[in-house]
Amino acid sequence: LPVNTRCKLEVSNFQQPYIVNRTFMLAKEASLADNNTDVRLIGEKLFRGVSAKDQCYLMKQVLNFTLEDVLLPQSDRFQPYMQEVVPFLTKLSNQLSSCHISGDDQNIQKNVRRLKETVKKLGESGEIKAIGELDLLFMSLRNACV
């Protein structure tokens, strides 16, 4: 069975109303530019076959992908929210740097790979969609990692 190490975020990360609000405002701005409402990145398929105790590790993978492959390429857009939210999410990513899983993470990798492929296939609109789901990313990190 998979064993988790240090897959934990302090609840205080999610108790700062200002940055919570900015994260959600960024998601809203991007979702207004997202026309593809049928596709969901952070949804039922992402969590399928992944037990709750392993979902923090799953969300760590999604967070790192979002930071490196989505937010950095789009960093000039959606200001002033982007310049405030990226450092906050980077801080969460750093706090999860020692979150590992030993054991079978096949389902996790498959689900994350599907999410990445969907974003890449959609091109820039996939990146916009991922930013529009930052509210889901944020809430899923809180739900899984606290």
């Epitope: 969901r40 952070i42 992402l46 105790k53 529009g132 809180r142 606290v146």
Partner: antibody, heavy 121, light 111 residues
Framework: EVQLVESGGGVVRPGGSLRLSCAAS????????MNWVRQAPGKGLEWVSG????????DYAASVKGRFTISRDNAKNSLYLQMNSLRAEDTALYYC??????????????WGRGTLVTVSS | QAVLTQPSSVSGSPGQSVTISCTGA?????????VSWYQQHPGKTPKLIIY???KRPSGVSNRFSGSKSGNTASLTISRLQAEDESDYYC??????????FGGGTKVTVLG
């Protein structure tokens, strides 16, 4: 088959306390966020409280914050709601509800039949 | 007082379509992807019919569909049937980590 069975309701005087329980079966309990939702007679639904899979986050409606405490015992497949300083306006049918899928405690896909709480002098 | 605003009632004839709106402040429906819809027949337990704005749980008729635009979410029931007569509630998760419900809409099937 998912089953949620609430118990612990009853008649209590204003200022009194009750502890509601929800016994879960038919699924891996500690994979899901759980919630309490209430419905006053003839009224709409009101979310009361929610807890994530491991009890790390516990959230409350403003109307019950400081009076109600949600908890869970994953070893016993059970969810609880400790209700203190009860008021007449807390009179309602209290439902236990489970997230529709494991990563989504906010979509309430499975509900119990409810337990009735009556606060009356 | 419900934070999300729904019409108290809507009606339609069998075979018609009806749409129920659910309007919130930007801090509720408008900002997020967390909208759900529930059906509740009198004396019965609520039933999830739409989650994640527009997804249908298995076993729910494809006559039910959800959408969202700005601060308003909508539930559309197409090809209305007698058994659709019920109360419908929208809900949204918020940045305050609470779930808000609309006040409910009674759907009446005419005739």
């Amino acid at each position: 088959e998912v089953q949620l069975v609430e118990s612990g309701g009853g008649v209590v005087r204003p200022g009194g306390s009750l502890r509601l329980s929800c016994a879960a079966s038919g699924f891996t309990f500690d994979d899901y966020g759980m919630n309490w939702v209430r419905q006053a007679p003839g009224k709409g639904l009101e979310w009361v409280s929610g807890v994530n899979w491991n009890g790390g986050t516990r959230d409350y409606a403003a109307s019950v914050k400081g009076r109600f405490t949600i908890s869970r015992d994953n070893a016993k497949n059970s969810l609880y709601l400790q209700m203190n300083s009860l008021r007449a306006e807390d009179t309602a049918l209290y439902y236990c509800a489970r997230g529709w899928y494991s990563g989504s405690p906010w979509s309430l896909g499975h509900w119990g039949r409810g337990t009735l709480v009556t606060v009356s002098s | 007082q419900a934070v999300l605003t729904q019409p108290s009632s809507v009606s339609g004839s069998p075979g018609q379509s009806v749409t129920i709106s659910c309007t919130g402040a930007s801090g509720d429906v408008g900002a997020y992807n967390f909208v759900s819809w529930y059906q509740q027949h009198p004396g019965k337990t609520p039933k999830l019919i739409i989650y994640d704005v527009n997804k249908r749980p298995s076993g729910v008729s494809n006559r039910f569909s959800g959408s969202k635009s700005g601060n308003t979410a909508s539930l559309t029931i197409s090809r209305l049937q007698a058994e659709d007569e019920s109360d419908y509630y929208c809900s949204s998760y918020t940045s305050r980590y609470t779930t808000e419900f609309g006040g409910g809409t009674k759907v009446t099937v005419l005739g």
